[in-house]
C-alpha cells in the first residue's frame, strides 16, 4: 500500500506588539518535533490593528476590546480550531506604555488590565500582557534577526540561504527604531562593556554571547519630533515656527497642550504667550539636521566612549540590521538598497525635503498626510541618529542593512520574545537526531 502522509504536526504562537503608534499581531508556526532547532519558526501572518497605540485609549479603556477584535478574529481564522486552546498569546507593550507609566502607573495598569481581560475572552492560551523593558526590546530584536539569519546554527554552510548572510557565525547587530524609543544592540569586539546596565550575557545553542544594548526612551521618531518642536518653539519670536524639517508650503497648527503632553518634552517646557502655534515648512535638510543634533547631548561622557546623553557605546563592530521604522522610512524614501552610499542618501534627503508640499501630496496620494508630512524629518533624523548618535561613518554605512523581513518573517522583537517565552532557544546545542520517521505511516 502507498504511504500516506499524516496531518502535519505543527504548533502556533501569537505575539502582539503594542507599540506607541500602533499594535501589530504576529502569528508564528513551527514543526512540533523540531522546537529546539534553529530557524524553524516562521511568521505566517501579520495583522496590523487599525487605529493608534493602546496608550491612546487611556481615556476610553472600555473600547480596547473593540479595537483588538479584528486582528484577534483574523488569528481565529488563520489558526486551525483544533490548535486554538494550545496556542499561546503574549502581548508586549513598548515605549508608548513606558511613557504612560512614567506619567501615571495607575493609568498604565488600567490599560493593561483591560487588555488582559479582552484577550482572555478568546479561545487561545493567553499568557499575559506586560510592558517590556527597553533592554528586553533590544535583546529580543537582536535574537530575532540572528535566529532568522541562521547565526545560531553551528552547521557551517558553503551556500547562503538568506540575504545579508556573510557565511560566518558572526552575529549581526540590531538597530530598532520605534515611535517612542530606539534600540542599539550588538556584540562588541573584545571590549569590556563599561556600564553594567548595558551588558547582557546569553548562552544560546552552546555558545556564549556578551551583548551590548541600550534603549533611548524619547528618541523614537515621533517623540524626537515632539522634542525638536518643543526645543525650537522656545526661541520662536511669535506663534509661527518656520521649520526646516517640513516641506516648503506645509502648514500645521499645533496645540501647546499637545506639545507638553508627553514626558519627553518636559525638559523644554516653558510658559508660552500663546496656546497654539503654526508650523510653516521651509524644507531645508541641512538646517533640519542641525536642529536635530541639538537633541543629542554629546558634551558629557563618563566612559571611554559614548553615544549621546552620557550613555556608554562601545566601538561599532560588524554588520547591522536596521529594522522597524529605520526600514519603513528608508523604504518609503527608496533608500534601502545596499548600493546607496551615505553621501547619496544625504543628497536624496536634501532633494526630498526641498520639494514643495503640494507636489509631495500629488505624488503620494495614497499616503496619510500626517505620515507623509513627517518623512523629511524622519529621514533626516535617521541619518543624524546613525551618524552623530551612534557614530556610523560614510565607510561603515555599508555595514547597515535596512531589513523589513528575513525569510518572510518581520524583523523586530516579537519573534525573539516568543522564542524565549516558549523555551525554544536552548542554552546548549541540541543533540543531532536521526531524521524523524513519524512523517509517514
Amino acid at each position: 500500500t502507498q504511504n500516506k502522509a499524516l496531518p502535519e504536526n505543527v504548533k502556533y504562537g501569537i505575539v502582539l506588539d503594542a507599540g506607541s503608534s500602533h499594535t501589530s499581531l504576529y502569528i508564528y508556526k513551527w514543526p512540533a518535533e523540531k522546537e529546539n532547532d534553529t530557524g524553524v519558526v516562521h511568521q505566517v501572518e501579520e495583522c496590523r490593528v487599525k487605529g493608534p497605540g493602546i496608550s491612546k485609549f487611556v481615556q476610553k479603556v472600555n473600547e480596547i476590546g473593540i479595537y483588538l477584535t479584528d486582528c484577534m478574529e483574523r488569528a481565529r481564522e488563520v489558526i486551525p480550531r483544533s490548535q486554538h486552546q494550545e496556542t499561546p498569546v503574549y502581548l508586549g507593550a513598548t515605549a508608548g506604555m513606558r511613557l504612560l507609566r512614567m506619567e501615571s502607573e495607575e493609568l498604565a495598569d488600567r490599560v493593561l488590565d483591560v487588555v488582559e481581560r479582552s484577550l482572555s475572552n478568546y479561545p487561545f492560551d493567553f499568557q499575559g500582557a506586560r510592558i517590556i523593558t527597553g533592554q528586553e526590546e533590544g535583546a529580543y530584536g537582536w535574537i530575532t534577526i540572528n535566529y532568522l539569519l541562521g547565526k545560531f546554527s553551528q552547521k557551517t554552510r558553503w551556500f547562503s540561504i538568506v540575504p545579508y548572510e556573510t557565511n560566518n557565525q558572526e552575529t549581526f547587530g540590531a538597530l530598532d527604531l520605534g515611535g517612542a524609543s530606539t534600540q542599539v544592540t550588538f556584540v562588541p569586539q573584545n571590549q569590556t562593556i563599561e556600564s553594567p546596565d548595558n551588558a547582557l550575557q546569553f548562552r544560546l545553542y552552546g555558545k556564549d554571547y556578551n551583548v551590548y544594548t541600550h534603549s533611548f526612551l524619547c528618541y523614537g521618531k515621533d517623540q524626537a519630533l515632539w522634542q525638536k518642536l518643543a526645543k525650537d518653539i522656545q526661541v520662536a519670536s511669535n506663534e509661527i515656527l518656520r521649520d526646516p524639517c517640513f516641506h516648503p508650503g506645509y502648514k500645521k497648527v499645533v496645540n501647546v497642550s499637545d506639545l507638553y503632553k508627553t514626558p519627553c518634552t518636559k525638559r523644554f517646557e516653558m510658559t508660552l504667550p500663546f496656546q497654539q502655534f503654526e508650523i510653516q515648512g521651509i524644507g531645508n535638510y541641512q538646517q533640519c539636521h542641525q536642529s536635530i543634533l541639538e537633541l543629542f547631548n554629546t558634551s558629557y561622557c563618563p566612559y571611554s566612549q559614548c553615544a549621546f546623553n552620557g550613555i556608554f557605546l562601545p566601538p561599532l563592530q560588524g554588520d547591522f540590521g536596521a529594522f522597524s521604522a529605520f526600514y519603513f522610512v528608508m523604504k518609503f524614501l527608496n533608500l534601502t538598497s545596499e548600493k546607496v552610499s551615505q553621501e547619496k542618501v544625504t543628497e536624496m534627503m536634501k532633494k526630498f525635503c526641498a520639494q514643495p508640499w503640494e507636489e509631495i501630496k500629488t505624488s503620494y496620494a495614497g499616503v496619510k498626510e500626517k505620515y507623509l508630512s513627517e518623512y523629511c524629518f524622519s529621514g533626516t533624523y535617521i541619518l543624524s541618529l546613525l551618524l552623530q548618535g551612534y557614530h556610523f561613518t560614510a565607510d561603515s554605512w555599508e555595514h547597515i542593512h535596512f531589513i523589513g523581513k528575513i525569510q518572510g518573517s518581520d524583523a523586530g522583537w516579537t519573534l525573539g520574545y516568543m522564542l524565549n517565552l516558549t523555551n525554544m532557544i536552548p542554552a546548549e546545542q541540541p543533540l543531532s537526531t536521526p531524521l524523524s520517521h513519524s512523517t509517514y505511516v
Epitope: 503608534s21 496590523r48 487599525k50 487605529g51 493608534p52 491612546k56 485609549f57 481615556q59 476610553k60 473600547e63 476590546g65 473593540i66 479595537y67 477584535t69 479584528d70 484577534m72 483574523r74 481581560r117 479582552s118 475572552n121 478568546y122 495614497g366 499616503v367 496619510k368 498626510e369 500626517k370 505620515y371
Partner: antibody, heavy 121, light 111 residues
Framework: QVQLVQSGAELVKPGASVKLSCKAS????????VHWVKQAPGKGLEWIGK????????KFDPKFQGRVTITADTSTNTAYLQLSSLRSEDTAVYYC??????????????WGQGTLVTVSS | EIVLTQSPASLSVSPGERATISCRAS??????????MNWFQQKPGQAPKLLIY???NQGSGVPARFSGSGSGTDFTLTISSLEPEDFAVYYC?????????FGQGTKLEIK
Amino acid sequence: QVQLVQSGAELVKPGASVKLSCKASGFSIKDTYVHWVKQAPGKGLEWIGKIDPANVNTKFDPKFQGRVTITADTSTNTAYLQLSSLRSEDTAVYYCALYGYDDDAYYFDYWGQGTLVTVSS
Amino acid sequence: EIVLTQSPASLSVSPGERATISCRASESVDNYGISFMNWFQQKPGQAPKLLIYAASNQGSGVPARFSGSGSGTDFTLTISSLEPEDFAVYYCQQSKEVPYTFGQGTKLEIK
C-alpha cells in the same frame, strides 16, 4: 478634511458589468476597512462586503458572492466595487464607507455621496 | 445570517420629547465581552451617519442626546430630547459576523 468621492451615475443594460470607484482624500484607506452598502430606491440599507486595503482580504454577504468584486489601489487611495451579470434588482444607490479608530482613538465614520446604478434595457 | 427586527417601523414624536427605538437580533450579537451592535441615522437624499457603535459608544461629533443600550439580542437607541434635525430614518446593524446585516429601519416623524 477627509472626503470620499464616488464615481458618477451609471445606466447599464441587464447582463452587463459596472465598476464603481471611491476615492479618499485626507485619509489613507490602508488605515481602515472600506465597506460597500446598497440601497434600492425607497428601501433600507444592505451590506455588500468590505476590504482591508492593507492586505486585500475581503468579506462578502454570500448573496452577492460571485457577482461582486471589491478591490483597492492604495497608490491612488481608491477602492472599487465591480458588479457583474446585472439585473433590474441591482438598481440602487451604492455607498462606500470607512469607519474605525483615528490616531487619537476617536471612532470616525466617513461616507461617499453614493453612486446611482440604473439597470435597464 | 443574523436577522435584525426593528420596532416600531415608524414613530411620531413631538420635538423636545423622548424617542426610543428597539432592535432585536435573531441570535446574540455578543462576542468576547462586546456587543457588536451599531446604530445609523439617514436623512433623505443623504448618506447614512454612524451614531452609536458597539451598543453604547457614541460616534465622533454625535450629540449627547443620542444613547444606546442593550446586550445579547435586545438593543435600544434613545434620543432624550428630540431636535428638529433628528427626524430621519434610523437603522441598527450587527457586525458580529459576516454578513453584517441591517434592520429594516425606523422612520422617526414629527408629530
